[in-house]
């Protein structure tokens, strides 16, 4: 054991910015740290062979497999991989160790496998063995977070069941309204499972991995708040976990909270109660409502009532399903040129939703708001002022929803022009679509006044520039206009854009352009 | 250099959860498939593994005290964190946690690099 | 779970003496078996891994035999810095176990 070379693998993964196959070299590319894989002489097996820790990588990564050597003079190589013998260049680090490396770039199902690397070095020859496989990202789940009381503690445990396992944390926030937005310096996260401080205005628990982020709010309703004008309503779907808070604060202790369902007092079991004096010496008193697993007959009014405070209720509805409610009829807008303008969807949806906005293949982010009325709402302001079809997609795990827009901007036309041996055609792009006129001009009419009626021929393309039509006139040449300058002209109620075109034999055409408001 | 370094209280009151942290460097638990373990050590007593993490998230506990562990990993922190309820003298220890690669030809070398231990105290 | 016995609990012998730890699985757990040393107020070391496999940097004096529930640490002659615990652990199933060590004391 003595005899043999101290060898260390190690896996270097890349910031994917290149795409050549998987290649030996000796200089990998920036990366970061190596990890180590724990190479070890593989037991039983004939000869020496070192094996390092399977490794599991995403499709397209970019990794470098890597040995490092201890044993004293020059070493060879070759690099195996499924039958083929790859080239290998080993080189010497500052501690004078061999280093062998393997650099696979944008990884493919055809570069996983087995990676076997020979060396020989002057004391004695063996092997050293890497698994790589692509790691199966379609077993990967996000789920929104739920809450659970810690057992023999008043204090909550938020659980989300996702892979790979998600970090946890608390959103905690002891503002109202805007300054609770999530990076408001209001607002405090803390990285952990359980939550003792539950007297807080607003609180989140949300849980993230490879996926993204899932958060769940604390239902809460606040005897010392006006109540909304409409009920606040809770969705929780069969076989979920229901938790509300009811939070009141008074001057003394002499007061006490109760729930109640549909004018029934909860069961005990399915409340426990926490009090705190504040700093101004007021004592807080907050009474927690759950239930472990929600069934249909769990639907109903849920009251909070205080002895000092005006009671306050939430309408909790039980569904066996997931929904999205909002209308889909598509809506068209058109806007000016530099009017502000955004697209909006107001729905109401269990569970959350996860949407996005799509224009021209393009996906952008969505980000939603609860109004007061349990509604969402989803705006969209970043179009640019590009006219065409706007796409909202929406879908959470039981129903999907798509909603279109179509955005017209209101702009004069622009005209392009184009000449062959046998017509003229011109092509605008304003909005309103436009209307065309073709004018000859001659000695009779040198102002181009001399309309053209005969062989023209209209249309509305039907390919779209970035979603917006495109339309077309063509004029078909006679022996009465070929030789003379033809204007045609694009009319739509912001103005007039003409492009002047002389009727010779085929080739490049002068083409000028007049632009007549 | 593969180091795993454990922290946390070093005394706590019975009925507490213990919260003990593995910080790790030199390896991650991203692409390896390596996992990682927490034992303890009573004061003069045997070694007495608690818990296991797998790279891909799967879990394993001590039967005897299954009901009060809970098990999890930060990958972008490297780090493991095991929680222990409602803690008891009993529970004072040493707390190791420890390495375990897994090699794809269906063999470990079970624990073969671990951190220093954390003395950890119950006491009112 | 699987239980390991390790036997004996302490031993006593001198530098140059051949030494013989055994450890008994409760159940066949093939070679999936680890020794490990461990030093006052210090961290286990891995010796031997998969039953007989020496531990990179470990002195050849250690060796490890044995397959399906009886396991054998040998150390053929002692030297000053081998007086410490020695535990077994088998990684065959979870929960993992531990043997309960063998002090090896000088006499």
């Known amino acids: 054991n003595q005899d043999l070379p101290v060898i260390k693998c190690v896996l270097i993964n890349h910031k994917n910015n290149d795409s050549s196959v998987g290649k030996s070299s000796s200089y990998p590319m920036v990366s970061e740290s190596p990890e180590d894989l724990g190479c070890a002489l593989r037991p039983q097996s004939s000869g020496t062979v070192y094996e390092a820790a399977a490794v599991e990588v995403d499709v397209s990564a970019s990794i470098t497999l890597q040995v490092l050597v201890d044993a004293p003079g020059n070493i060879s190589c070759l690099w195996v991989f499924k039958h083929s013998s790859l080239n290998c260049q080993p080189h010497f680090d500052l501690q004078n160790r061999g280093v062998v490396s393997m650099v696979i770039l944008k990884m493919t199902e055809t570069q996983a496998g087995e990676y076997l690397l020979f060396i020989q070095s002057e004391a004695t020859n063996y092997t050293i063995l890497f698994t790589v496989s692509i790691r199966n990202t379609l077993l990967y789940t996000l789920r929104r977070p739920y809450f659970r009381k810690m057992e023999n503690q008043d204090a909550l445990v938020c659980i989300s069941e996702s892979v790979p396992e998600p970090i946890v944390e608390w959103v905690l926030c002891d503002s109202q309204g805007e300054s609770c937005k999530e990076e408001s310096p209001a607002v405090v996260k803390k990285e952990e499972k359980v939550l003792h401080e539950l007297f807080g205005t607003d609180i989140r628990c949300c849980a993230r991995n490879e996926l993204g982020r899932e958060c769940t709010r604390l239902f809460t309703i606040d005897l010392n708040q006006t109540p909304q004008t409409t009920l606040p309503q809770l969705f929780l779907k069969v076989g979920e976990p229901l938790w509300i808070r009811c939070k009141a604060v008074h001057v003394n202790h002499g007061f006490g909270l109760t729930w109640e369902l549909e004018n029934k007092a909860l069961e005990e079991g399915n409340y426990f109660e926490m009090s705190t004096y504040s700093t101004n010496r007021t004592m807080i008193r907050i009474l927690f409502a759950f239930v472990s697993s929600v069934a249909r007959n769990d639907t109903g009014y849920y009251t909070c009532s205080s002895s000092k405070h005006p009671s306050q209720s939430a309408l909790v509805t039980i569904v066996e399903k997931g929904f999205i409610n909002a209308t889909n009829s598509s809506e068209d807008y058109e806007i000016d040129q530099y009017e502000e303008f955004c697209f909006s969807v107001r729905f109401k949806a269990y569970p959350q939703i996860r949407c996005t906005w799509t224009f021209s293949r393009k996906s952008f982010p969505c980000e939603q708001k609860g109004l007061d009325n349990g509604y969402s709402i989803s705006k969209f302001c970043n179009h640019k002022h590009q006219p065409g079809e706007y796409i909202f997609h929406a879908e959470n795990d039981d129903a999907q929803f798509t909603k279109m827009f179509t955005l017209n901007i209101r702009r004069k036309p622009q005209v392009l022009a184009e000449a062959s041996a046998s017509q003229a055609s011109c092509f605008s792009d304003g909005y309103p679509l436009p209307s065309w006129t073709w004018k000859k001009c001659s000695d009779k009419s040198p102002n181009c006044t001399e309309e053209i009626t005969e062989g023209v021929w209209n249309r509305k393309a039907n390919r779209k520039v970035f979603g917006q039509w495109v339309s077309s006139s063509t004029l078909n040449m006679s022996e009465a206009i070929k030789g003379f300058l033809v204007k045609c002209c694009a009319y739509n109620s912001l103005g007039t854009s003409c492009e002047t075109i002389l009727l010779n034999s085929p080739g490049p055409f002068p083409f000028i352009q007049d632009n007549i408001s | 250099q593969v180091t795993l370094k454990e922290s946390g209280p070093t005394l706590v009151k019975p009925t507490e959860t213990l919260t003990l942290t593995c910080t790790f460097s030199?390896?991650?638990?991203?692409?390896?498939?390596?996992?990682v373990s927490w034992i303890r050590q009573p004061p003069g007593k045997c070694l007495e593994w608690l818990a296991h993490?797998?790279?891909?998230?799967?879990?394993s506990y001590s039967t005897s005290l299954k009901s009060r562990l809970t098990i999890s990993k930060d990958t972008s922190k490297s780090q493991v964190v095991l929680t222990l309820t409602n803690m008891d003298p009993v529970d004072t220890a040493t707390y190791f946690c420890?390495?375990?690669?897994?090699?794809?030809?269906?063999?470990?070398?079970?624990?073969?690099?671990w951190g220093q231990g954390t003395m950890v105290t119950v006491s009112s | 779970d699987i239980q390991m016995t390790q036997s004996p609990s302490s031993l006593s012998a001198s530098v140059g003496d051949r030494v013989t730890i055994t450890c008994r699985a409760s159940?066949?757990?093939?070679?999936?078996l680890a020794w490990y040393q461990q030093k006052p107020g210090k961290a286990p070391k891995r010796l031997i891994y998969?039953?007989?496999s020496l531990q990179s940097g470990v002195p050849s004096r250690f060796s490890g035999s044995g397959s399906g529930t009886e396991f054998t640490l040998t150390i053929s002659s002692l030297q000053p810095e081998d007086f410490a615990t020695y535990y077994c652990?088998?990684?065959?199933?979870?929960?993992?176990?531990f043997g309960c060590g063998t002090k090896l004391e000088i006499k």
């Open positions: 998969a039953a007989s």
């Open positions: 420890a390495r375990m690669p897994e090699y794809s030809s269906g063999w470990s070398g079970a624990f073969d690099i």
């Open positions: 030199g390896f991650s638990l991203r692409y390896a498939r390596m996992g």
């Open positions: 159940q066949d757990i093939r070679n999936d």
């Open positions: 993490i797998f790279s891909n998230d799967e879990k």
């Open positions: 652990l088998q990684h065959n199933s979870y929960p993992l176990t």
